[in-house]
């Protein structure tokens, strides 16, 4: 440890490099300055991401993994720091950058949207479920007519290239479908998607985007919705959707539509049954939808409504006379 009267001069790290290690993923590496004295003190490093999005954090080790988009380039700095209770000593910054890839910005795709969905696996010998991925995009406004686009996704350590594309009238790929992926339904990692392109006439700027799974996961509708009327009680039941999440992880909305007077009742529930008091003169259609609750992951998308179930009377019953 430093003595109170001891002076220390901090030197910046050396050999600072940025290496692309995967789709939308870089590794920052550096070495302690070999001329740094007082090696026995607990030196730390402050890492600052300058672009594409500002961030900074501290670390004791001499490397750092970063998940980030790269189509705008990437720039970072690192410096040596020494902290105690009262003050912070810091060296000057060492900096490095990756330039934006070639191609004018107008050649890259725009409006990339992706959704994931869980489906039963037809190939599996066991009853198991797969996560599919569907992405769509628009052709860049400055992209030559012969441009062809190619999509890749990375989830964790797996990177896959799209094999099933949809095309526009010029034969350019504008959507991609992965029936099976290595994406985890319950995963907390970012999904990275890259669309690059090629043309004989000009360089096509790649475009990459990070997606949080909870924000793009299209939940399946609830299963086996049933509704029955006993007197003035409408009893509705259903089962949880096909999903990796267990039964306690779902919020539901029940929609009861009185087709006679148009009245619409929507109830939010955490259970898989609901009883409503109704009149016995009307016909009703009933639908249920689901979402993963915030107890189990960050709020996301609601499922589509289940197919409507019709209950109640078709005929217009005369009012009872006393």
């Amino acid at each position: 440890d430093l003595l109170p009267d001891e002076k220390i001069s901090l030197l910046p790290p050396v050999n600072f490099t940025i290496k692309v290690t995967g789709l939308a993923q870089v590794l920052l590496q550096w070495k302690p300055n070999p001329d740094q004295e007082q090696r026995n003190v607990n030196l730390e490093y402050q890492v600052k991401i300058n672009a594409p999005k500002e961030d900074d954090y501290e670390t004791r080790i001499t490397e750092s993994k970063c998940v980030t988009i790269l189509h705008k380039g990437f720039s970072a700095s690192v410096r040596t720091i020494l902290q105690n209770d009262h003050s912070l000593l810091a060296s000057s910054w060492a900096s490095a950058e990756l330039h934006a890839p070639p191609g004018s910005p107008g050649t890259s795709i725009v409006n990339l949207t992706c959704t994931t969905n869980t489906t039963e696996d037809n190939y599996s010998r066991l009853r198991s479920y797969q996560v599919s991925l569907h992405c769509t995009w628009l052709v860049g406004t400055d992209a030559p007519e012969d441009t062809q686009y190619f999509l890749y996704y990375r989830y964790g350590s797996w990177t896959e290239e799209c094999q099933e594309y949809s095309k526009d009238t010029l034969g350019r790929n504008i959507a991609c479908w992965f029936p099976r992926t290595f994406i985890l339904s319950k995963g907390r990692d970012w999904l990275a998607v890259l669309v690059n392109g090629s043309s004989k006439h000009s360089a096509i700027r790649p475009f990459d985007q990070l997606f949080a799974l909870h924000a793009i996961d299209q939940i399946n509708p609830p299963l086996n919705v049933t509704a029955e009327i006993e007197g003035t009680r409408l009893s509705i039941q259903w089962e949880k959707p096909v999903s990796a999440f267990p039964i306690h992880c779902f919020d539901y909305e029940v929609k009861i539509h009185n087709t006679r007077n148009g009245y619409l009742q929507i109830e939010k529930l955490m259970t898989n049954a609901f009883i409503s008091i109704i009149d016995d003169l009307s016909k009703y259609d009933v639908q249920v939808r689901a979402a993963v609750s915030s107890m189990c992951r960050e709020a996301g998308l609601w499922s589509e409504w289940s197919q409507p179930i019709y209950v109640g009377n078709d005929e217009h019953k005369p009012l009872r006379e006393w």
């Epitope: 599996s124 198991s128 350590s157 990177t159 896959e160 992926t181 994406i183 985890l184 319950k186 990796a244």
Partner: antibody, heavy 121, light 112 residues
């Protein structure tokens, strides 16, 4: 029924190379991701590598990254593991297994009987 | 040192119930990732015993069951039989590791 048959194991000197093969039958090989898992003598299971159904995407354990290469020939229903720069700690029984997933979490539903690789001078 | 921790050995008499634990962390079992169990009889290849926490492939007796809570999982075997003597391994997914596949160190079950 599913059958996986490994071959190619044997005795090799440190720094040497070996190529393992796994012949698959009884299922549509090209629909499945595949994997290699090893077990050192008297020790537990260690996942080594995996490859997607089309053969274009691969994954490795840190302990073999840069030394081992997984590949497949769907026309021949065969999985391969090219092992270079072998070390004594690579000595193990190497199993070929399908790399199935449920909601994305991998598991190994079918296994071969294994082939022994011994790295020793 | 395995990422998932299992007791090296357990033993019980025929007919008894035995449980084998598998302890993980927030980056694997604690994140809700499924746990799978394998049985390896002496001198043979491993065999999938339980997948997705508690599902049995066809042919696996219902004496075997799996459960999970927090950062741990358990394999329970009831009505223990001599042929259950084997090594048992848990396996899951770990988001912090390259390749993501993680095994427990294995548990040797001895039927007394």
């Amino acid at each position: 029924q599913v059958q996986l048959q490994e071959s190619g194991g044997g005795l090799v000197q440190p720094g040497g190379s070996l190529r393992l093969s796994c012949a698959a039958s009884g299922f549509t090989f090209s629909n499945y991701a595949m994997s290699w898992v090893r077990q050192a003598p008297g020790k537990g299971l260690e996942w080594v590598s995996a490859i997607n159904s089309g053969g274009k995407s691969t994954n490795y354990a840190d302990s073999v990254k840069g030394r081992f290469t997984i590949s497949r020939d769907n026309a021949k229903n065969t999985l391969y593991l090219q092992m270079n720069s072998l070390r004594a700690e690579d000595t193990a029984v190497y199993y070929c297994a399908d790399y199935a997933t449920n909601y994305g979490v991998p598991y190994f539903g079918s296994w071969g009987q294994g082939t022994m690789v011994t790295v020793s001078s | 040192q395995s990422v998932l921790t299992q007791p090296p050995s357990v033993s019980a008499a025929p007919g008894q119930r035995v449980t084998i634990s598998c302890s993980g962390s927030r980056s694997n079992i604690g994140s809700g990732y499924d746990v799978h169990w394998y049985q390896q009889l002496p001198g043979t290849a491993p065999k999938l015993l339980i997948y997705d926490d508690n599902n049995r492939p066809s042919g696996v007796p219902d004496r075997f069951s799996g459960s999970k809570s927090g950062t741990s999982a358990s394999l329970a075997i009831t009505g223990l039989q001599a042929e259950d003597e084997a090594d048992y391994y848990c396996q899951s997914y770990d988001s912090s590791l390259s390749g993501h596949v993680v095994f427990g160190g294995g548990t040797k079950l001895t039927v007394l």
